[in-house]
Amino acid sequence: GITNINCSGHIWVEPATIFKMGMNISIYCQAAIKNCQPRKLHFYKNGIKERFQITRINKTTARLWYKNFLEPHASMYCTAECPKHFQETLICGKDISSGYPPDIPDEVTCVIYEYSGNMTCTWNAGKLTYIDTKYVVHVKSLETEEEQQYLTSSYINISTDSLQGGKKYLVWVQAANALGMEESKQLQIHLDDIVIPSAAVISRAETINATVPKTIIYWDSQTTIEKVSCEMRYKATTNQTWNVKEFDTNFTYVQQSEFYLEPNIKYVFQVRCQETGKRYWQPWSSLFFHKTPETVPQVTSKAFQHDTWNSGLTVASISTGHLTSDNRGDIG
C-alpha cells in the first residue's frame, strides 16, 4: 500500500489515522528533502491532487483540512515542488480510515445444528462500522466457572468437543475496533436446549385422482431426535399469504402430508422443524414448486425439479385459525 513507500519526510493525521466518520481532520505533511526548500507542498487523495483548504505552516510543513470527512478509506500522499526540479518530489504517504465505534452486540444466539459437531453463535452487530472490527465470544461454564474466548470477525463455530464444562454456559460477545469497545448482555444456554434437527427436505409431490383430487407432499429428515415438531407452509405462487400446517413428527419413515388444492395452479411449499418444546427452528427449506393438474391425470413433481431461489417475501401466515405476520428469522 501507500504506507510502504520510501519517505523524504513525514505525513500524519490529526486526530488519528483512524477516526470517526464525519469528523473534521487535518493532514500534515513535512518535507525533509536534501537541497530542497519546497516552493510548494501538494496533497493527493486517491491519486487526485487536492486544490482547496491547504495552508502552509512553515518552510517545510503544510496542512490539508477536511470538513466532515465521510470516506471509509483513502490513500493520501504529499509531494514537494523543489526549485530546479522539473517534477514534484514524493515526500510520504499514508492510508487513512473513517468509521464508527461498534454498537452493542445484541440478539446473541447459539445453536447446535445436528451432526455439525459445532455450536454456532451469531449476533446482530448493529450498524456498519466501515473499519476493522473484531469480536471476542466469551463462553463460560456455569458448572466449572472456566471461561474460553474465541476471536472472530463475524460469527463463530465452536467445536462441541471443546465444551467440556458440562451443559450450562453463559455466552456474551465483546466488539472492539480502533474507535471503541462494547459488550453484549449475557446469554444463558443449555446444550440440550439449542439443538436444531437435521434439515427437513421435501422430496416430491403428487396429485392423486379421486373424487376430490388431493396432493401428497413427501418429506423427510435424517434427524435422530425423537420428538420433533414441524411446520409446512404453502401458497399459490401468485399469493402473498402463506397457509401453515403443523405436525408432530416421527422421522422413522418418510412423511406424507395431504393437501386439497385448487386445480391448474402452481403452488410453493416449504418445511421447517424444531425439537419439540425447544426455542430454535430450522431455517425454512428450499422452495418446492408443484403445479396441480387441470383435471384427472396424476402429476408428480420431484425434488430435483424444484427451484431454489429465495422468495424474500414478507407474508402473512394462517396457523390454527390465527392470522400472524410470518417474517420470522431462520432460527428464531
Epitope: 516552493r39 510548494k40 487526485i48 491532487k49 487536492e50 482547496f52 491547504i54 502552509r56 518552510k59
Partner: antibody, heavy 119, light 107 residues
C-alpha cells in the same frame, strides 16, 4: 504557439444572462487549469472563476461575488472554456479574460471580451 | 485568502531610470510570486514567475527578487515601451490573488 480567443461579450440588462467562450489552441488543454479573470473599468485584476486541470479532477473555484450566479465549465474535446453568467449586475461590468495556468500563476491570456451590464 | 499590497500605486519616471516596485504579502508566500505588465486595452503579460525567474522572451532589464513576505520588481533602465501598469500575483495558496497594481507613467 498558445492562443486564447474569447467571445460572447456584449451589452446586457441587469438580471439577464450571458455565456462567454474561450477557444484554446497550441497546448494540451486538459493538462492545464483555465480561469476567467475580470477587470472592471479603471480597476485591477480579479479572479472570477477557475476550473483546474485533469490532475485536480477539474475542481472549480468561484469568487464570493459570483458564487451561485456564474458557472465555469470546459469541453476538453473542443478545447473550449465557458463562463455561464446568470443574474447579471451592474458591478459585473468588466473586460473578461480567459487565462491558462499550469502551476498557479497565469502564463497566457486571451485578448479579453467586454461585458456591459446596463439598463 | 492571502492579501497582496503593492507600492507605490503609481510612479512617474523617465526613460533610462531604474524603477523599483514592491509587493508585500499578508503571510510568507515562499517565492510563489509572479509579475505582470499590462498596457491600456491589452491583456496582462507574464514577466517574472517564482519571484525571480524571467519568462521566455522578456527583456533582461526586468528582474525580480525577494523572499518571505516582501518582493520587488526592478526595471534596470526604463524604456518607452515599459510605461504600463504592473501587477503582482501570489500563487502560494489557493486561490491566487493579485496586488492592486502600480501605474508607471512618463515624468
Amino acid at each position: 504557439q498558445v492562443q486564447l480567443v474569447e467571445s460572447g461579450g456584449g451589452v446586457v440588462q441587469p438580471g439577464r444572462s450571458l455565456r462567454l467562450s474561450c477557444a484554446a489552441s497550441g497546448f494540451d488543454f486538459s493538462s492545464y487549469g483555465m480561469s476567467w479573470v475580470r477587470q472592471a473599468p479603471g480597476k485591477g485584476l480579479d479572479l472570477v472563476a477557475d476550473i483546474n486541470s485533469k490532475s485536480y479532477n477539474y475542481a472549480t473555484y468561484y469568487a464570493d461575488s459570483v458564487k451561485d450566479r456564474f458557472t465555469i465549465s470546459r469541453d476538453n474535446s473542443k478545447n473550449t472554456l465557458y463562463l455561464q453568467m446568470n443574474s447579471l449586475r451592474a458591478e459585473d461590468t468588466a473586460v473578461y479574460y480567459c487565462a491558462v495556468h499550469h502551476s498557479d500563476y497565469f502564463e497566457y491570456w486571451g485578448q479579453g471580451t467586454l461585458v456591459t451590464v446596463s439598463s | 485568502d492571502i492579501q497582496m499590497t503593492q507600492s507605490p500605486s503609481s510612479l512617474s519616471a523617465s526613460v533610462g531610470d531604474r524603477v523599483t516596485i514592491t509587493c508585500r504579502a499578508s503571510q510568507d508566500i515562499y517565492t510563489n510570486l509572479a509579475w505582470y505588465q499590462q498596457k491600456p486595452g491589452k491583456a496582462p503579460k507574464l514577466l517574472i514567475y517564482h519571484a525571480s525567474s524571467l519568462q521566455s522572451g522578456v527583456p533582461s532589464r526586468f528582474s525580480g527578487s525577494g523572499s518571505g513576505t516582501d518582493y520587488t520588481l526592478t526595471i534596470s533602465s526604463l524604456q518607452p515601451e515599459d510605461f504600463a501598469t504592473y501587477y503582482c500575483l501570489q500563487d502560494s495558496e489557493y486561490p491566487p490573488t493579485f496586488g492592486q497594481g502600480t501605474k508607471v507613467e512618463i515624468k
